[in-house]
């Protein structure tokens, strides 16, 4: 499928336009801000998200920026520049001229530069870490019971392979989630770990991606797991390369 | 609970179609992916396809890509196999098999489906 | 495709008897330490139940018995005790990449 027939609409991405103008009166669905047409019965890359949510009408809300010491993304929200297969471009650049490298889930790798700033390849994410704390229970979940769980969501709602889950950690109230995917690992029409975990992310913090669909309602042996804050890490192939001045 | 429950047998003509129902209650229906398995007699299992629940569509085993379609109607709770163009070596039992938690394996399996074909 | 080769297809044995099945997958179905690689059981005339996930972890609800060990590509199914009720046919099965495949099976009878 492409997308919804019935009423042409894009399940995986409500930042989309649809019409049935594709081959044969198909629906087909473009990405807001990019234009790029999307296969709305997988994830949509987190470049072409990225950049529809920088296009959305803007509302009130601030930005949360994380600890500036967590290796996370602190840079927040920027336009992204993606390629034609929607994947993030190694070098971004803002509307002054300042450039940098980011990874392939758009997180950036080196200190900012100028418009000579060369960014040899889209280095991949191949190991990320989502850490959650969830909100106060009767009592612990059961740490085999959690790790289906989770497994099954990956599975069945983000279409992730359970072999990319490299494992569940979990130390009440702290649950961590591995995601593990090297390049010779992917095959085509796999999902790639870093949209998986961007979807998970903007789930569970009740900004779900997905159209129609009720939000997240993650439910351990029927108990709900409710989070309360969410850090992601990510881990690249090749090790990023910042100036020690940004260490110190 | 968990209970697939699978339609009855069939006895079908060379070159027809045989469309086989699964039908699963005790647990959310959209909350797991459905397989399908077939065993001819006296031989192995050969897994089909799986279809999301969720997303409404199928992946399949090349073997069977152009004759099998997998679909799924979450009002009903109920998964469906239609093979076509059906040949003598189809004649097998047929199963739906719900994906566990966690790794992919079949945690629960219908009944079976006895397809006959034969002239 | 992976390949699968379970042996023996086919064994015999005493109550109370340790029977041990093997499979050999043509690829590593371990990702990170988790072997996609399942044992089920089939009685005649029934559908399969599962009995060892994940290459060793033991389903719900199914008897200490039966255990699974191994990773990788060698795989092996035991039944400590062999009881009248394990008459059956044993399939592996890998779950890693599809289209999922399984072992030819191994018929077990009681001597």
């Known amino acids: 499928h492409t997308a919804a027939q019935d009423n042409c609409t894009c399940p995986t991405n409500k930042m989309t336009v649809c019409s049935p103008d594709g081959p044969g009166g198909r629906c087909q669905c473009r990405a807001l801000g990019s234009g790029v047409a999307v296969d709305c019965s997988t994830l949509t890359s987190e470049c072409l998200l990225l950049k529809a949510r920088m296009s959305a009408p803007k509302n009130a809300r601030t930005l949360v920026r994380p600890n500036e010491h967590a290796l996370v993304d602190n840079d927040g929200l920027y336009d992204p520049d993606c390629d034609p297969e929607g994947r993030f471009k190694a070098r971004q650049c803002n509307q002054t001229s300042v450039c940098w490298c980011v990874n392939s889930v758009g997180v950036r790798r080196t200190d900012k530069g100028d418009l000579s700033l060369r960014c040899d390849e889209l280095v991949r994410t191949h190991h990320i870490l989502i850490d959650l704390r969830h909100r106060p229970t009767a009592g612990a979940f059961n740490h085999s019971d959690l790790d289906a769980e989770l497994r099954r969501l990956f599975r069945e709602r983000y279409r992730l392979h359970p072999k990319f889950v490299a494992a569940v950690h979990y130390e009440q109230p702290t649950i961590q989630i591995e995601l593990r995917q090297n390049t010779s690992q992917k095959a085509a029409g796999d999902v790639d770990i870093g949209d998986a975990a961007y979807y998970f992310e903007r789930d569970v913090k009740g900004e779900s991606l997905f159209q129609g669909r009720g939000g997240l309602d993650l439910r351990v042996r029927g108990e709900p797991l409710q989070v309360e804050r969410t850090l992601i890490y990510y881990l690249d192939e090749i090790p990023p390369k910042f100036s020690m001045k940004r260490l110190t | 609970q968990v209970q697939l429950v699978q339609s009855g047998a069939e006895v079908k003509k060379p070159g027809s179609s045989v469309k086989v129902s699964c039908k699963a209650s005790g647990y959310t229906f959209t909350d797991y992916s459905i397989n399908w398995v077939r065993q001819a007699p006296g031989q192995g299992l050969e897994w089909m396809g799986v279809i999301s629940t969720y997303y409404g569509d199928a992946s399949y085993n090349q073997k069977f890509k152009g004759r099998v379609t997998i679909t799924a109607d979450e009002s009903t709770s109920t998964a469906y196999m239609e093979l076509s163009s059906l040949r003598s070596e189809d004649t097998a039992v047929y199963y739906c098999?719900?994906?566990?938690?966690?790794?992919?394996?079949?945690?629960?399996w219908g009944q079976g489906t006895l397809v006959t074909v034969s002239s | 495709d992976i390949q699968m080769t379970q042996s023996p297809s086919s064994l015999s044995a005493s109550v109370g008897d340790r029977v041990t099945i093997t499979c050999r997958v043509s690829e590593s179905v371990d990702s990170y330490g988790n072997n996609f690689m399942h044992w089920y059981q089939q009685k005649p005339g029934k559908a399969p139940k599962l009995l060892i996930y994940r290459a060793s972890n033991l389903e719900s609800g199914v008897p200490s018995r039966f255990s699974g060990s191994g990773s990788g590509t060698d795989f092996t199914f035991t039944i400590s005790s062999l009881q009248p009720e394990d008459i059956a046919t044993y399939y592996c099965q890998q779950s890693y990449e599809d289209p999922y495949t399984f072992g030819g099976g191994t018929k077990l009878e009681i001597k």
């Open positions: 098999a719900r994906y566990g938690d966690g790794y992919n394996q079949f945690d629960y």
